[in-house]
């Protein structure tokens, strides 16, 4: 018996608008109906929770209103989007998946997605 496998891309480059999207896919050992997905950021030996959502299989993924994350789910796949990123937010973003119900509980952690964020150059002043 091993930990539940979670797959995510190794590297993602955020858009010039500070938006990064990636897929988190998990190999469910059972028929979970309630799943919790958490995005963690590891950088400079610090770990912070970026966002988290619990969803019922077949329903929409709902984050808190003030969350910087949005997402959709399809089967054992979660499509995550993180917004409002700046260069200082560059780091390893880890997908943590917990199968909450029905028992037994399972935990899986991905190997992390390195998200690179490059702040856009300010537009040069124009006389026009």
């Amino acid at each position: 018996c091993k930990a539940m496998h979670v797959a995510q891309p190794a590297v993602v480059l955020a858009s010039s608008r500070g938006i990064a999207s990636f897929v988190c896919e998990y190999a469910s050992p059972g028929k979970a109906t309630e799943v919790r997905v958490t995005v963690l950021r590891q950088a400079d030996s610090q770990v912070t929770e970026v966002c988290a959502a619990t969803y019922m299989m077949g329903n929409e993924l709902t984050f808190l209103d003030d969350s910087i994350c949005t997402g959709t789910s399809s089967g054992n796949q979660v499509n995550l989007t993180i917004q409002g990123l700046r260069a200082m937010d560059t780091g390893l973003y880890i997908c943590k998946v917990e199968l909450m119900y029905p028992p037994p509980y399972y935990l899986g952690i991905g190997n992390g997605t390195q998200i690179y964020v490059i702040d856009p150059e300010p537009c040069p002043d124009s006389d026009f």
Epitope: E49, K96, E98, G112
Partner: nanobody
Framework: EVQLVESGGGLVQPGGSLRLSCAAS????????IGWFRQAPGKERETVAC??????SYADSVKGRFTISRDNAKNTVYLQMNSLRAEDTAVYYC??????????????????????WTQGTQVTVSS
């Protein structure tokens, strides 16, 4: 699936010792980091120590006093607590995390990475 059961809590005088055990069933401990955490009344749950196949890591507040070890044959992790102080009084939890290549000595014990939490065992240090 992994199931963890901890034992060994109790009442001890300052300067005394206790040993907590965390026994795993349903899986070998090998692919997991096992951590000990504690929560005192009105405070956040905090890291005490954790161990994987080759490394251990401790909170500064317990270094030199607590020792974490694992017995793979018994599928059990132990927390030997010596020179106990009143401030060590808390509910102690055992939890597991899949061992990952990006874990560092500083992050492998971080509570965000853990699941399979036990119910907790009370440790009270008082005279």
């Amino acid at each position: 699936e992994v199931q963890l059961v901890e034992s060994g809590g109790g009442l001890v005088q300052p300067g005394g010792s206790l040993r907590l055990s965390c026994a795993a069933s349903g899986s070998t401990l090998d692919p997991f980091v096992i951590g000990w955490f504690r929560q005192a009344p009105g405070k956040e749950r905090e890291t005490v120590a954790c161990i994987n196949r080759s490394r251990t890591s401790y909170a500064d507040s317990v270094k030199g006093r607590f020792t974490i070890s694992r017995d793979n044959a018994k599928n059990t992790v132990y927390l030997q607590m010596n020179s106990l102080r009143a401030e060590d009084t808390a509910v102690y939890y055992c939890a597991a995390s899949p061992d990952k290549p990006f874990y560092t000595d500083q992050t492998m014990c971080n509570k965000h990475y853990y699941g399979y939490w036990t119910q907790g065992t009370q440790v009270t240090v008082s005279s």
